[in-house]
Interface confidence: low
């Protein structure tokens, strides 16, 4: 069976091969072909011509239909580490390193502390942190991580919260809290992460992060 | 009918201290974060303060960190604003505001004008 379809490519090749060389020796105005027989060969050849092109621009249109498809509905998601900082902040630092995600410009790390927004929408939005704390060295007050939300010409608020007691365990207990919800943004919204006692975060690889993506 | 009244601005000398209050109404105030917002003579809003609902968490812009302290008393729907060391770009009038899903709720403001 496969001599058989062997045979008929070979075969196609050999036709396509004798009128490839039909039209050169049209081209050449050679006196063993008549003309009639050229002009009827040139239109064929002609007609092919224009398949492939209309071809070509059936799928150029139907590409760039799904890059239209595609930009009006980007893919928005970021994923960025944890950053120990020397400021005394309670808002947690971050940092495009490691095996971070950033998609487009349409999300943005500003500042170092927020993660911005351009296109409204519902994103799920989720942060990790562990930290690393001990009952006798911490106040009587639990470790507490918040999510909190910026939306232009509006004053910040929590979206979520989550709660640890400190550990009995010395120096200190490694702990994680997480934290993740579905939340309508506005453009220009920033979302960023509080912490009772950033000193206490733990910053090693893969303990602390803080992401976004776009439903 | 959410309602929320501020008072206690007024003329204070740089370094001086004064406190606000906002008499909240039409809501459950204990369900609900609630913030200081100030706007300064031709500035845009800035928030200021926010605490938590039950009162255990309170935030703080860098500009007023250390100096100014929020606080509530839930069973008086009331929300403070104690503002110590007061510097002349203090100057604003002062919102207390309640945070909605699609906008935010506001007081009608009071002045606190920080000059010597």
């Known amino acids: 069976h496969r001599r058989l379809d062997k045979i008929e490519d070979e075969r196609n090749l050999h036709e396509d091969f004798v009128f490839m060389k039909t039209i050169q020796r049209c081209n050449t105005g050679e006196r063993s072909l008549s003309l009639l027989n050229c002009e009827e060969i040139k239109s064929q050849f002609e007609g092919f011509v224009k398949d492939i092109m209309l071809n070509k621009e059936e799928t150029k249109k139907e590409n760039s239909f799904e890059m239209q498809k595609g930009d009006q509905n980007p893919q928005i998601a970021a994923h960025v580490i944890s950053e120990a900082s020397s400021k005394t902040t309670s808002v947690l630092q971050w940092a495009e390193k490691g095996y971070y995600t950033m998609s487009n410009n349409l999300v943005t790390l500003e500042n170092g502390k927020q993660l911005t927004v351009k296109r409204q929408g519902l994103y799920y939005i989720y942060a990790q942190v562990t930290f690393c704390s001990n009952r006798e060295a911490s106040s009587q007050a639990p470790f507490i991580a918040s999510l909190c939300l910026k939306s232009p010409g509006r004053f910040e608020r929590i979206l979520l919260r989550a709660a640890n007691t400190h550990s009995s365990a010395k120096p200190c207990g490694q702990q994680s809290i997480h934290l993740g919800g579905v939340f309508e943004l506005q453009p220009g919204a920033s979302v960023f992460v509080n912490v009772t006692d950033p000193s206490q975060v733990s910053h090693g690889t893969g303990f602390t992060s803080f992401g976004l993506l776009k439903l | 009918e959410v309602q929320l009244l501020e008072s206690g601005g007024g003329l204070v000398q740089p370094g001086g201290s004064l406190r606000l209050s906002c008499a909240a109404s039409g809501f459950t105030f204990s369900n609900y974060q609630m913030a200081w917002v100030r706007q300064a003579p031709g500035k845009g809003l800035e928030w200021v303060s926010s605490?938590?609902?039950?009162?255990?968490?309170?935030y703080y812009a860098d500009s007023v960190k250390g100096r100014f302290t929020i606080s509530r008393d839930n069973s008086k729907n009331t929300l403070y604003l104690q503002m110590n060391s007061l510097r002349a770009e203090d100057t604003a009038v002062y919102y207390c505001?309640?945070?909605?899903?699609?906008?935010?709720?506001w007081g009608q403001g009071t002045l606190v004008t920080v000059s010597s």
């Open positions: 605490i938590t609902s039950e009162g255990g968490s309170t």
């Open positions: 505001a309640k945070p909605g899903k699609n906008f935010d709720y």
